[in-house]
């Protein structure tokens, strides 16, 4: 039994929030300030993520878990764990390397992020434009011209919504 214990890694007893200190006979030492270990048996603690500048702190670092960041207002998160912050634009704009630029005629963006997308081409579905598009809003397709002949009902179900990012072919 003694032989088995001596072969066992003494560091495996060190819980999260500590590290196995080789300089102190493999004693479990608490993680120093601004560092953490999220699992047991660690030989070092990891440096806490710093949320500064474009990032702000969503969750403080603790001895057992890293800090979590989000973006300062005016920017939004990109990537896993908010690894980047990207500038917001106004509706009717898209972000380019030159900053926020208005959508070109015939395109729209109804969000603060993403790209300007082409207006729906109502005629592809055999429909007519009921409400014109703007930089901020897609066109609204109405009934086809044939549906507007006398005696025909002027109420038709709306055209199916396109998936974001898919422009009409």
């Amino acid at each position: 039994f003694e032989r088995t214990r001596s072969l066992q890694d003494p560091c495996s007893n060190c819980p999260a929030g500590t590290f196995c200190d080789n300089n102190r006979n493999q004693i479990c030492s608490p993680c120093p300030p601004n560092s953490f270990s999220s699992a047991g048996g660690q030989r070092t603690c990891d440096i806490c993520r710093q949320c500064k500048g474009v990032f702000r702190t969503r969750k403080e670092c603790s001895s057992t878990s890293n800090a979590e960041c989000d973006c300062t207002p005016g920017f939004h998160c990109l990537g896993a764990g908010c690894s980047m912050c990207e500038q917001d634009c106004k509706q009717g704009q898209e972000l380019t390397k030159k900053g926020c630029k208005d959508c070109c005629f015939g395109t729209f963006n109804d969000q603060k992020r993403g790209i300007c997308r082409p207006w729906t081409n109502c005629s592809l579905d055999g429909k007519s434009v009921l409400v014109n598009g703007t930089k901020e809003r897609d066109v609204v397709c109405g009934p086809s011209p044939a549906d507007l002949s006398p005696g025909a009902s002027s109420v038709t179900p709306p055209a199916p919504a396109r998936e974001p990012g898919h422009s009409p072919q």
Partner: nanobody, 123 residues
Framework: EVQLVESGGGLVQPGGSLRLSCAAT?????NYWMNWVRQAPGKGLEW???????????YYVDSVKGRFTISRDNAKNSLYLQMSSLRAEDTAVYYC????????????????SGQGTTVTVSS
Amino acid sequence: EVQLVESGGGLVQPGGSLRLSCAATGFTLSNYWMNWVRQAPGKGLEWVANINQDGSERYYVDSVKGRFTISRDNAKNSLYLQMSSLRAEDTAVYYCARGGEGYGVDHYGLDVSGQGTTVTVSS
């Protein structure tokens, strides 16, 4: 450790000039687009300017065009913002920020920024 440290802020009178510097450590500056962003008191963060890897492309928010100049010295791993004809509305904390991998292609995300330097324009 990847780090950006801004300096050069201060109190300046309207119409005056300042030059902000940003020292990069822990990475090679010449591989990245770099940006300046700012946050005025009580306002959201605003993008100010960016510059591509070799300095051949530079872009500015409309409100600073003709007054601010972004530049870089890759040999010194440093980024600069020359500010002239300063106005009260330029009062803000200015941050240097690195464009993340794929900046300008897939996204315009910033992945590293400094603690900021404060610019106050007042008489």
